[in-house]
């Protein structure tokens, strides 16, 4: 019963249009096109949107005219491939237009970067901001979205036009207000946040669609919505999981208009269908469109029925467990994993999705043996260690966090990351042992009942991270096993790797340890990255520097660098004290 | 007090649809497997089916296709939808609980009353 | 799957010791699921046994269960004037779809 079918139209452009409206339209062929084209200037995409919506409009007018009849793939695929420098910039991306559709999609897909090397945005100052945002206010938010698109060729285009909305009232309401940059700059630093967070949790729903496929996806969504509706039926929460998986699979797959199109339609059904679904829905669904979805994405749990009965009844007491899961395996283990997950909003959503697969191979194996029962009669005493794990190492890090602060529990991050994978590119051990760091902040203040599932799935983005980064460009086999094998052992998989003893210490080079008064100018946070980043290069120097050694040399480098930049001669002071501070630390490290 | 009262039973025509309600009171409805049993005048019991506490239902195979059970949890009710019915299908029908929670047992320790189906033209 | 039970109809006397078996036509489910049941004129059937030994919960300790496998019996050991009543066996199978119910024996007074 998905809510998605249509008449078949003629035109799918037209139909696409007169759905979403010519703003959002127009907005949407922008994200996908930036997506794609990620090099592309501004102005280049921006005639290329023109032209499409043109064309939509002439196919509103008449859905027999010329070329209307074609898909959307086509249509965007034959305006992409008229770009004229697409050989120079995008190299063997070019190849892609001598193919034909579903295949030059496909090969559009696979030529999105991750990590583009594009020069990181900076923001000027709050009245050039302003006057430019008067001056042309359509232009101002459309540059918003090509250089958000371009660098997160993943993030969720219905989502990215919530972020425009609130970007487009930051700026509305601030550049009236008295103090600008004091009301303007705290919204931009959110959504800045926000949005970050956003593309990090939409690529791996991506990843776990394209690497893992839908099945994992499905199981994923089953074990969430459960855990947000646990009063909504099994039968309501799989049309929710069928028609979640149809709305994301079209957004990663580059059809931003149908994703778009078929979330607002989820939205839609799910606010006319609330009393079956959760009671929590009432003031998200008073909302206008954009942030209606929004939030019911991030919709608190409801509250969980009174007297669920014992889930070892149907799935270990029964008789009949073995008949069931033959009968219709994926919807007996989605049975489970919607009762399981219903009840447990206390664990993450891949701690449920472990224990629904240590079940499956339990069933497996018992439905073949001579007693089933007696096989499978104790498979809920094999969940203990899986639950005991990610809860230990959660109160474990919390200590630590907070013991440690944030800056410093990321540097015991960095070291211990660094010691796993000494192979991977600094700036990205760096990246994402920053961002592991912060799940101290953002979880260890949560009660117990609201740790895990905040923590281990916030983790799962991170590594979801090092993974697509690390696939670009493969240096270490065991980021590889841990990113390919299971997407739900992920972080396990990463937790139990040791120092790797094969690693080769990397050569000593004085430049890495040479800084310069620059730094002295920049902001706290990245002092940090400056920072971090040595100590980075230390444990490669050194993979097997104690805790103590490399607390030593970086306590006399934050030493170094406040004293430097106290000093009248700055640049001096960094030169020589800098020789000496790398001495030192070669002397300290033994290297 | 822990009872079961039937209810939904009366004349129906051969061919019509009759759906009968079974109302439980002094426990959760979701805490064991409920059952279906009638028996026709003069004769003996006759298994229907169950429902168990995770919502899965098992049915006798003549009764298969045509019978459904389900249940409302906020109601604390149970159901049994019939449809096609036919002459021989006129008996008293029983809701009862069961022992187990998964499965049937056959094991009923609580038994409603019973509500009279009549199908004839 | 059958359950037979036999005789179908018995007369005995107060404080007779009365014997009805029941037989399936396969092994009930772990061997034991058996249960047997009284059911007087115009009242729901009772529950007095089940997994084929245990007695349900305020019945009378005159009433026992014993078998095994496809072969089960009830005993009354001394009959009392309030037993006399139709009791059937009810079986549980290796599937919930198979429960099934014995055609009923009649124990009527002498």
């Known amino acids: 019963r998905g809510v998605f079918r249509r008449d078949a139209h003629k035109s799918e452009v037209a139909h696409r249009f007169k759905d979403l409206g010519e703003e959002n339209f127009k907005a949407l062929v922008l994200i996908a096109f930036a997506q794609y084209l990620q090099q592309c200037p501004f102005e280049d995409h921006v005639k290329l949107v023109n032209e499409v919506t043109e064309f939509a409009k002439t196919c509103v007018a008449d859905e027999s005219a010329e070329n209307c009849d074609k898909s959307l793939h086509t249509l965007f695929g034959d305006k992409l491939c008229t770009v004229a420098t697409l050989r120079e910039t995008y190299g063997e991306m070019a190849d892609c237009c001598a193919k034909q559709e579903p295949e030059r999609n496909e090969c559009f897909l696979q030529h999105k970067d991750d990590n583009p090397n594009l020069p990181r945005l900076v923001r000027p100052e709050v009245d050039v901001m302003c006057t430019a945002f008067h001056d042309n206010e359509e232009t101002f938010l459309k540059k918003y979205l090509y250089e958000i698109a371009r660098r997160h060729p993943y993030f969720y285009a219905p989502e990215l036009l919530f972020f425009a909305k609130r970007y487009k009232a930051a700026f509305t309401e601030c550049c009236q207000a008295a103090d600008k940059a004091a009301c303007l700059l705290p919204k931009l630093d959110e959504l800045r946040d926000e949005g970050k967070a956003s593309s990090a949790k939409q690529r791996l729903k991506c990843a776990s669609l394209q690497k893992f496929g839908e099945r994992a996806f499905k199981a994923w969504a089953v074990a969430r919505l459960s855990q947000r509706f646990p009063k909504a039926e099994f039968a309501e929460v799989s049309k929710l999981v069928t028609d979640l998986t149809k709305v994301h699979t079209e957004c990663c797959h580059g059809d931003l208009l149908e994703c778009a199109d078929d979330r607002a339609d989820l939205a839609k059904y799910i606010c006319e269908n609330q009393d079956s679904i959760s009671s929590k829905l009432k003031e998200c669904c008073e909302k206008p469109l954009l942030e209606k979805s929004h939030c019911i994405a991030e919709v608190e749990n409801d509250e969980m029925p009174a007297d669920l009965p014992s889930l070892a009844a149907d799935f270990v007491e029964s008789k009949d467990v073995c008949k069931n899961y033959a009968e219709a395996k994926d919807v007996f283990l989605g049975m489970f994993l919607y009762e399981y997950a219903r009840r447990h909003p206390d664990y993450s959503v891949v701690l449920l999705l472990r224990l629904a697969k240590t079940y499956e191979t339990t069933l497996e194996k018992c439905c073949a043996a001579a007693d089933p029962h007696e096989c499978y009669a104790k498979v809920f005493d094999e969940f203990k260690p899986l639950v005991e794990e990610p809860q230990n190492l959660i109160k474990q890090n919390c200590e630590l966090f907070e013991q440690l602060g944030e800056y410093k529990f990321q540097n015991a991050l960095l070291v211990r990351y660094t010691k796993k994978v000494p192979q991977v590119s600094t700036p990205t051990l760096v990246e994402v042992s920053r961002n592991l760091g912060k799940v101290g902040s953002k979880c260890c203040k949560h009660p117990e009942a609201k740790r895990m599932p905040c923590a281990e799935d916030y983790l799962s983005v991170v590594l979801n991270q090092l993974c697509v980064l690390h696939e670009k460009t493969p240096v270490s086999d065991r980021v590889t096993k841990c990113c390919t094998e299971s997407l739900v052992n992920r972080r396990p998989c990463f937790s139990a790797l040791e120092v790797d003893e094969t690693y080769v210490p990397k050569e000593f080079n004085a430049e890495t340890f040479t800084f310069h008064a620059d730094i002295c100018t920049l902001s706290e946070k990245e002092r940090q990255i400056k920072k971090q980043t040595a100590l980075v290069e230390l444990v490669k120097h050194k993979p097997k520097a104690t805790k103590e050694q490399l607390k030593a040399v970086m306590d006399d480098f934050a030493a170094f660098v406040e004293k430097c930049c106290k000093a009248d001669d700055k640049e001096t002071c960094f030169a020589e004290e800098g020789k000496k501070l790398v001495a030192a630390s070669q002397a300290a490290l033994g290297l | 007090e822990v009872q079961l009262v039937e209810s939904g039973g009366g004349r129906v025509q051969p061919g019509g649809s009759l759906r009968l309600s079974c109302a439980a009171s002094?426990?959760?409805?979701?805490?064991?497997?409920m059952g279906w049993v009638r028996q026709a005048p003069g004769k003996g019991l006759e298994y229907i089916g169950i429902?168990?506490?995770?919502?899965?239902?098992y049915y006798a195979s003549w009764a298969k296709g045509r019978f459904t059970i389900s249940r409302d949890n906020s109601k604390n009710t149970l159901y049994l939808q019939m449809n096609s019915l036919r002459a021989e299908d006129t008996a008293t029908y029983f809701c009862?609980?069961?022992?187990?929670?998964?499965?049937?047992?056959?094991?009923?320790?609580?038994w409603g009353q019973g509500t009279q189906v009549t199908v004839s033209s | 799957i059958q359950m037979t039970q036999s005789p179908s109809s018995l007369s005995a006397s107060v404080g007779d010791r009365v014997t009805i078996t029941c037989r399936s036509s396969?092994?009930?489910?772990?061997?034991?699921?058996l249960s047997w049941y009284q059911q007087k004129p115009g009242q729901p059937p009772k529950l007095l046994i089940y997994?084929?030994?245990d007695l349900a919960s305020g019945v009378p300790s005159r009433f026992s269960g014993s078998g095994s496998g496809t072969d089960f019996t009830l005993t009354i050991s001394s009959l009392q004037p309030e037993d006399f009543a139709t009791y059937y066996c009810?079986?549980?199978?290796?599937?919930?779809?198979?429960?099934?119910f014995g055609g009923g024996t009649k124990l009527t007074v002498l």
């Open positions: 429902i168990s506490v995770g919502g899965f239902t």
């Open positions: 009810a079986g549980g199978f290796s599937s919930s779809s198979d429960t099934a």
């Open positions: 997994d084929a030994s």
């Open positions: 002094g426990f959760s409805l979701s805490s064991n497997a």
């Open positions: 009862a609980r069961d022992r187990h929670g998964g499965d049937s047992s056959g094991a009923f320790y609580l």
């Open positions: 396969e092994s009930v489910y772990s061997n034991n699921q």
